[in-house]
Interface confidence: medium
């Protein structure tokens, strides 16, 4: 999966938008969660609402909120008020019984608030290294990943 | 009408590679899985995997992994499943069935299956 | 994997009594969303297995109503209200739940 970057500005609310094919993932429900590592496991944070006819429906755990609109196919999530603590790589998953399927993988930046005069710098992400899966666009407020970016700080 | 045409009858060696056709009509390929399931002889059913047409997405059973392939051409809505490494215990009817879809909730159930393709391993 | 276990295997019934049979899964069928995807196929001699009944209960197009699905979690059950000479062959429940999707063993139908 290419993995799409998503910037937010700190403070204020992003919204992370997966489409996918509605008549493939039919019945599912989804959910969102973060990357614990390049290598970990991937900790739900939020999943749409148990029945699936009431996907639609947001649901919030903390700041975070969701809702499916299953006959277009998009997977909607708003991280609310931003902190620099949720930049990191999440994915949109697609549940079947015991299993997952990876719908989007999505890295988020966190941008310092332009108004906020501390001197923090102006973005924060999650780390360098030497290379990572290509990233592609889709929002206006994204962008693709730089060459020699990875979304997590190298393993010593 | 829904229609799932399979491969003929195929004989091979043990060590071998098979690859089987099922080719789909009378409904929209690219937009319900396909899954591969066998039957040895006077034994039961045993689900091999399955494949989403639309993007070429597989899963397969565990016991299959790293033998089996399953492929699909779109433009002629013919699905494959391909088994290496052939055995004696690979002897088996071969067959190629839909997954239902069916609203509120996909069913995941098989509503048509293929006529099947006999299989023989032996040297 | 979750296993499927049926009883009996096999079954020889009067024309026009009743039958069942019985599928029991090693965990709970119930899906992620809600639903329980268990199923009931019939394969007759020498042909593909058919649908029966999808998601416990729901009778599949063209089959007759004296077939019908019940049960919930682990334990269900198929019943045919009066058995007719078309009915014989291998009565299977699948589990499409959880990938691997599994079948029980089989249960074959005679007439006596």
């Known amino acids: 999966h290419n993995t799409t970057v998503f910037q937010g500005v700190a403070g204020q609310s992003l919204q992370v938008s997966c489409p996918y094919d509605s008549m493939k993932h039919w019945g599912r429900r989804k959910a969102w969660c973060r990357q614990l590592g390049e290598k970990g496991p991937c900790q739900r944070v939020v999943s749409t609402h148990n029945l699936w006819l009431l996907s639609f429906l947001r649901r919030w755990n903390g700041s975070t909120a969701i809702t499916d609109d299953t006959l277009g196919g998009t997977l909607t999530i708003t991280l609310r008020n931003l902190q620099p603590h949720d930049a990191g790589l999440y994915q949109c998953q697609s549940l079947h019984g015991s299993e997952a399927d990876t719908l989007r993988k999505v890295l988020v930046e966190v941008l310092a608030d332009p108004l906020d005069h501390r001197d923090a710098g102006d973005l924060w992400f999650p780390g360098e290294s030497e290379s990572f899966e290509d990233a592609h666009v889709e929002h206006s407020i994204s962008r693709s990943l730089l060459e020699g970016e990875i979304p997590f700080p190298p393993t010593s | 009408q829904v229609q799932l045409v399979q491969s003929g009858a195929e004989v091979k060696k043990p060590g071998a590679s098979v690859k089987v056709s099922c080719k789909a009509s009378?409904?929209?390929?690219?937009?319900?899985?396909m899954n591969w399931v066998r039957q040895a002889p006077g034994q039961g059913l045993e689900w091999m995997g399955r494949i989403y047409p639309g993007d070429g997405d597989t899963n397969y059973a565990q016991k299959f992994q790293g033998r089996v392939t399953m492929t699909r051409d779109t433009s002629t809505s013919t699905v494959y499943m391909e088994l290496s490494s052939l055995r004696s215990e690979d002897t088996a009817v071969y067959y190629c069935?839909?997954?239902?879809?069916?609203?509120?909730?996909?069913?995941?159930?098989?509503?048509?299956w293929g006529q099947g393709t006999l299989v023989t391993v032996s040297s | 994997d979750i296993v499927m276990t049926q009883t009996p295997l096999s079954l020889s019934v009067t024309p026009g009594q009743p039958a069942s049979i019985s599928c029991r899964s090693s965990?709970?069928?119930?899906?992620?969303?809600?639903?329980?995807?268990l199923h009931w196929y019939l394969q007759k001699p020498g042909q593909s297995p058919q649908l029966l009944i999808y998601k416990v209960s729901n009778r599949f197009s063209g089959v007759p109503d004296r077939f019908s699905g019940s049960g919930s979690g682990t334990d269900f059950t198929l019943k045919i209200s009066r058995v007719e000479a078309e009915d014989v062959g291998v009565y299977y429940c699948?589990?499409?739940?959880?990938?691997?999707?599994?079948f029980g063993q089989g249960t074959k139908l005679e007439i006596k």
């Open positions: 965990q709970s069928l119930v899906h992620s969303n809600g639903y329980t995807y």
């Open positions: 009378g409904y929209a390929f690219s937009s319900s899985w």
């Open positions: 069935a839909r997954l239902l879809r069916n609203q509120p909730g996909e069913s995941y159930a098989m509503d048509y």
């Open positions: 699948s589990q499409s739940t959880r990938v691997p999707y599994t």
